[in-house]
Structure formats: structure tokens, C-alpha cells
């Protein structure tokens, strides 16, 4: 039985050229996290954090993605094309798979504020 819940940063905004931290947090379960996958809106993998081997950033994103903090992911040098959905997928044992969603809006405006409240989707 899957008892856990994924908390995410929910809907966030950041300005073009800036950076943003995508965060998910798995709670209410004692399951062991074996791997966390980070995917973009088009389902392309950005990064994997494997419990044994650590982080692997996929080639297309190596220049703009940094691992962490924690199980999160830092996107840098944001462009308007980065607007969209991002998904964290927690592979756990014995529970199985948990998935969280974050919506990122990249704004042209220099007054764009980064909101980072945690939400349960």
C-alpha cells in the first residue's frame, strides 16, 4: 500500500536569464528511495539521482542544469521555452512510484518574483 505523498513547489515563476530551484519532497512513508527522475513537459529526462551512483545530468541539459539542493534540481539561464510542466518521479521500495508536478512560468518582466511555496498536488 502506498502511504506517501509528494510535496512540490507547485506553480512557480522566475525571470528570463535567471535560475530556479525545482523541489519535491516525499513524506509519510518509510519506503527507500532508489531513484529520482526529473522530466520536462515534453517527457524528456533532465536528470536522474540514483541512490547508489548519484546524479546524472542528460547531455542536452548539462550546461543549464545543476544537481541539488538535496533531491531537487537547479535550472539556470532560463529561456521562455522553459515554461511548462516539470515532473519528479520517485522510484521507491517497496511502495513503487510517486510522481509530483511543478509548473514553471518564465517571465520577461524584470520584476518577476520567484514564489516557492510547497503544495500537495
Amino acid at each position: 500500500m502506498m502511504t506517501g505523498t509528494i510535496e512540490t513547489t507547485g506553480n512557480i515563476s522566475a525571470k528570463k536569464g535567471g535560475s530556479v530551484i525545482l523541489q519535491c519532497h516525499l513524506s509519510s512513508t518509510m519506503a527507500q528511495v532508489t531513484q529520482v527522475n526529473w522530466e520536462q513537459h515534453d517527457h524528456s529526462l533532465l536528470a536522474i539521482r540514483n541512490a547508489e551512483l548519484g546524479w546524472h545530468i542528460y547531455p542536452a541539459f548539462k550546461d543549464r542544469v545543476a544537481p541539488g539542493p538535496g533531491l531537487g534540481l537547479t535550472l539556470q539561464s532560463l529561456t521562455m521555452n522553459d515554461t511548462g510542466e516539470y515532473f519528479c518521479t520517485y522510484h521507491t521500495y517497496p511502495d513503487g512510484t510517486y510522481r509530483g508536478r511543478i509548473f514553471l512560468e518564465v517571465l520577461e518582466s524584470s520584476v518577476a518574483e520567484h514564489s516557492a511555496r510547497f503544495q500537495i498536488p
Epitope: 541512490a51 547508489e52 548519484g54 541539488g68
Partner: antibody, heavy 121, light 107 residues
Framework: EVQLLESGGGLVQPGGSLRLSCAAS????????MSWVRQAPGKGLEWVSA????????YYADSVKGRFTISRDNSKNTLYLQMNSLRAEDTAVYYC??????????????WGQGTTVTVSS | DIQMTQSPSSLSASVGDRVTITCRAS??????LNWYQQKPGKAPKLLIY???SLQSGVPSRFSGSGSGTDFTLTISSLQPEDFATYYC?????????FGGGTKVEIK
């Protein structure tokens, strides 16, 4: 005693293939990620590839991606590196190493004695 | 990829000297930093893991410090058997990159 013993090195022509083996003893092989690291003559250390304990996750250096394949047989306590389309720049001493172990922040704590691969016509 | 820059590339020291080697990562790697010692014709040996944890069996004259991007390996009192090449390596993310090495030679 924890031990790693490499074999399979030798002289091969450019474009040729070799398979390196690494026999492990003295620890529970299947619970540890394993790596291959190489050292060209007179040069520093270069990580080549790593594999998770189950063999389900594998990663490679860009310099060998698509040409080398890491694998393991946990029933035989053996790690392998299949090297195809070999180039002169692959000439090096190849070491197998236990680790790293991300969740413990542990490095490569046991190394084999190394096996020499020479690619030359 | 995370670049690891070691300095100096070589140094000359005498037995009993205090020796310091530095390693800088191109981005934060928290404490996922290891130090290795290698002697000619031999395999590398893990000295320090997690930036400051001494590997079992390694003499206490070796110590490591640092977090984020800047790290240090210190040998408090150099012994004859310590003349070797030292490498730092990050294990936060693949590819697990090594520094270029520091050769510690006898003065």
C-alpha cells in the same frame, strides 16, 4: 580480504575489441556499485564507467559512450568492460574499483592492480 | 560536467613538513569529494572520503576539509612513504571527474 583482480588486457589494433574482467572477492559484490577508471601513460586518472549493484543503471564517460559497455555477473562476482572500436587514445592501464557509494558519500575504496590495454597497429 | 582543478601540480617538500594541496570544483559538490594517493606503478588508494572522513587504515597525519567548491588535503608531517601523486575526485555526479593531480617530491 577484499580484493579485485583484473584481466583481459593486451595489444589490439585500432578498430579492434577487447573484454576486460574484474573478479571480486571478500565483500558482498551485488550490493556495491562498481567502476572502471583508466590512466594513460604519464597522465592522470580518468573515470570510464560505473554500474549499480543490480546492474540496472550504467553510466559512461563521453569519450567511450557508444563504444564501451559495462556489465556484471553477480552470480560470478565479476565485473566486465566490453571495449569495441578501440582507438589509440584508449591506450591505458584500466583499473576496476569498488564504488563510489553516493548514499554514504563514499569514494572508490578498493582498487584492482590494473590491466594494460595497448591500441596500436 | 563538473571540472576539478588541483593546485599546485607539483611541490617539493622535506620529511616533517606540513603539506597542503587544494582542489576546486566548478560548481558546488557539497561534500562529495574524495582524495587518493598513487605511487608509481601502483593502483590509487583512497585516503579521504566525504571531504573530511579518514578512510580506515589511513594514518591520522592525513586530513581533509572543505565543502561546496573549495577543498584541502593536509599532510601534517610528511613521511618518506608519502612522496606520491595525490588526486581529488568528485562523486556527486557522473562523469566522476578527477583533478589533474599533485606530485609531492623530495626537496
Amino acid at each position: 580480504e577484499v580484493q579485485l583482480l583484473e584481466s583481459g588486457g593486451g595489444l589490439v589494433q585500432p578498430g579492434g575489441s577487447l573484454r576486460l574482467s574484474c573478479a571480486a572477492s571478500g565483500f558482498t559484490f551485488s550490493t556495491y556499485a562498481m567502476s572502471w577508471v583508466r590512466q594513460a601513460p604519464g597522465k592522470g586518472l580518468e573515470w570510464v564507467s560505473a554500474i549499480s549493484g543490480s546492474g540496472g543503471s550504467t553510466y559512461y564517460a563521453d569519450s567511450v559512450k557508444g563504444r564501451f559497455t559495462i556489465s556484471r555477473d553477480n552470480s560470478k562476482n565479476t565485473l566486465y568492460l566490453q571495449m569495441n572500436s578501440l582507438r589509440a587514445e584508449d591506450t591505458a592501464v584500466y583499473y576496476c574499483a569498488k564504488g563510489p557509494r553516493y548514499q554514504d558519500r563514499a569514494g572508490m575504496d578498493v582498487w584492482g592492480q590494473g590491466t594494460t590495454v595497448t591500441v596500436s597497429s | 560536467d563538473i571540472q576539478m582543478t588541483q593546485s599546485p601540480s607539483s611541490l617539493s617538500a622535506s620529511v616533517g613538513d606540513r603539506v597542503t594541496i587544494t582542489c576546486r570544483a566548478s560548481q558546488s559538490i557539497s561534500s562529495y569529494l574524495n582524495w587518493y594517493q598513487q605511487k608509481p606503478g601502483k593502483a590509487p588508494k583512497l585516503l579521504i572520503y566525504a571531504a573530511s572522513s579518514l578512510q580506515s587504515g589511513v594514518p591520522s597525519r592525513f586530513s581533509g576539509s572543505g565543502s561546496g567548491t573549495d577543498f584541502t588535503l593536509t599532510i601534517s608531517s610528511l613521511q618518506p612513504e608519502d612522496f606520491a601523486t595525490y588526486y581529488c575526485q568528485q562523486s556527486l555526479a557522473t562523469p566522476y571527474t578527477f583533478g589533474g593531480g599533485t606530485k609531492v617530491e623530495i626537496k
